[in-house]
């Protein structure tokens, strides 16, 4: 969830040591409070829709609910990227969009959502029980992946509602690192607040840009009706690859985007998101991982914005998808 906190400007402290100490102890709680309030868990939602006109045509929509800067989106089918899935498309907010058969058109819908049209006949065409996965690499959250497929009984033209992604698995470094820092910060904040409990309250000067009192604003998707889940049965007879769902498969190496640009790229401005808001759906496989960028910011500035590839020496099977995405 995305949450923002407005921190009021503080009255400049009195000169001298006490003033300096007072300034430090006043600023720190607010910084920590901001961290605590803004520390929400990002989510990825996936929506798969079969077009009424062509039974072998699908539209996949994915979105990222988080406050970070999206640096890459990877769409795959046949399971998650690290568990035998094959990459269909890769979208970068500044550098371009790549898609491979049977993907026909990939595009940014909004700054944080994408859509992909698949079509085809024969062995490479998608079918009703195919699983589609979307992986969002974002800074600072890490990489988050969610998967979805059409419900067993679905009419052409109707869709599985978007599936938000609960945390099923996460990189230990990411979870312990970020959560540990935030937990420590929040505990320390409480400690500071208790220490200041009996002291006279500091004089707060409202921010010039926002005169209202400090407040936190939480953003969350509305819970829409789940009626779309109950749809008539449709028979689909196409050959397709089996959906391999393997939650226990950890990634066999570092993510190929382990080194990401430290600047926040200007993300594409797209049309308004499609009408439906992400809502929970039953029976959807979802996997999430949170990878931290160990090498972020290590690239020398003269090379320009960059992503570092880590090609797999083990050959084509290990490098199933394009761009060395696992």
């Amino acid at each position: 969830m995305r949450t923002e906190a407005q921190v009021p400007a503080l009255q400049p402290p009195e000169p001298g040591l006490e003033g300096a100490m007072g300034h430090r102890t006043l600023v720190l709680p607010w910084v920590l409070l901001t961290l605590c309030v803004t520390a929400g868990t990002p989510e990825v939602w996936v929506q798969v829709r079969m077009e009424a006109t062509e039974l072998s045509s699908f539209t996949i929509r994915c979105g990222f609910l988080g406050s970070g800067s999206i640096s890459l989106v990877t769409v795959s089918w046949g399971g998650p990227n690290g568990a035998g899935g094959t990459t269909l498309a890769v979208l970068h907010p500044e550098r371009g969009i790549r898609q491979w058969a049977p993907a026909r058109q990939a595009r940014w819908e909004t700054q944080s959502s994408i859509s992909l049209i698949l079509e085809g006949s024969g062995a490479s065409s998608p079918c009703a029980n195919t699983t589609f996965c979307c992986k969002f690499a974002s800074f600072p959250e890490g990489s988050w992946e969610a998967c979805g497929s059409l419900p067993p009984s679905s009419d052409p033209g109707l869709s599985a509602p978007p599936t938000p992604a609960p945390i099923l698995r996460a990189d230990l470094a990411g979870i312990l690192g970020v959560s540990g820092v935030l937990l420590f910060g929040c505990v320390y904040l409480l400690h500071l607040l208790r220490r200041h409990k009996h002291r006279p309250a500091p004089r707060l000067q409202p921010s010039r840009t926002s005169p209202q009192a400090p407040r936190a604003r939480a953003w969350a998707p509305s819970q829409a009706s789940q009626a779309a889940l109950h749809v008539p049965y449709a028979t689909i007879n196409t050959s397709c690859r089996p959906a391999t769902l393997d939650t226990a498969h950890p990634h066999g190496g570092p993510s190929w985007w382990a080194s990401l640009p430290t600047h926040a790229a200007h993300r594409p401005q797209g049309p308004a998101a499609w009408a439906s808001t992400p809502i929970p759906a039953r029976g959807s496989f979802v996997s999430v991982e949170n990878g931290l960028y160990a090498q972020a910011g290590e690239r020398p500035p003269h090379t320009g914005p960059g992503l570092t590839l880590f090609p797999d020496p083990r050959g084509p099977r290990a490098m199933e998808g394009p761009l060395g995405v696992r």
Epitope: E94, R95, G96, W100, P305, G306, L307, M319, P322
Partner: antibody
Framework: QVQLQQSGPELARPGASVKLSCKAS????????ISWVKQRTGQGLEWIGE????????YYSEKFKGKATLTADKSSNIAYMQLSSLTSEDSAVYFC?????????????WGQGTSVTVSS | DIVMTQSQKCMSTSVGDRVSITCKAS??????VAWYQQKPGQSPKTLIY???NRHTGVPDRFTGSGSGTDFTLTITNVQSEDLADYFC?????????FGGGTELEIK
């Protein structure tokens, strides 16, 4: 350093096929894509398509679907383009170029080109 | 397909001058534009990638700018060896498309 060495000139009859090669050195094909570009005499550049050897899934510009077939042999680090059903319109110089996906997301290094002449 | 338009087919300049070659995309391509130089009888060489980043070994008199739909390659202090065709390329989305090219002529 990165180099792309293309095969020698080709002279072919109309209706025949030719297979051009592009040998990569200084890097491995599994880590980068290979794009092919056509240039007719005194004309501009036309992008034919790209193969990303890691996926073996080429993308072809609509105009070259059915005309060009892109493949790659990862073990020998060579990319190929086969041109079929040749006509005089296919007479041109064909360049291979490396598609980089770490910094550039476009073509960075180019081969020297292969001249294809279709004549009866 | 995205159309890349280089309105100037030919430009004439003198050694030491500054020249700007423009390229316009038919839709927003963010910063996914590269510039290539092709000297007579040679293969193209990369000058600029991602609109404004110089390729390895490219002299700093070559500068790329722009984003969205309008892009410019500027050559300051033009040298005689800069006589060549200059092409822009959009790589935002498949199929990648080149501009028609601008021939730089040295007076």
């Amino acid at each position: 350093q990165v180099q792309l060495q293309q095969s020698g000139p080709e002279l072919a009859r109309p209706g025949a096929s030719v297979k051009l090669s592009c040998k990569a050195s200084g890097y491995t094909l599994t880590s980068h894509g290979i794009s092919w570009v056509k240039q007719r005499t005194g004309q501009g550049l036309e992008w034919i398509g790209e193969i990303y050897p890691g996926s073996e899934s080429p993308y072809y510009s609509e105009k070259f679907k059915g005309k060009a077939t892109l493949t790659a042999d990862k073990s020998s680090n060579i990319a190929y383009m086969q041109l079929s059903s040749l006509t005089s319109e296919d007479s041109a110089v064909y360049f291979c170029a490396r598609s980089d996906y770490s910094d550039y997301w476009a073509m960075d290094y180019w081969g020297q080109g292969t001249s294809v002449t279709v004549s009866s | 397909d995205i159309v890349m338009t280089q309105s100037q087919k030919c430009m004439s300049t003198s050694v030491g001058d500054r020249v700007s070659i423009t390229c316009k995309a038919s839709q927003n391509v963010r910063s996914a534009v590269a510039w290539y130089q092709q000297k007579p009888g040679q293969s193209p060489k990369t000058l600029i990638y991602l609109a404004s980043n110089r390729h390895t070994g490219v002299p700093d008199r070559f500068t790329g700018s722009g984003s969205g739909t309008d892009f410019t390659l500027t050559i300051t202090n033009v040298q005689s060896e800069d006589l060549a065709d200059y092409f822009c390329l959009q790589h935002w989305n498949y199929p990648w498309t080149f501009g028609g090219g601008t021939e730089l002529e040295i007076k």
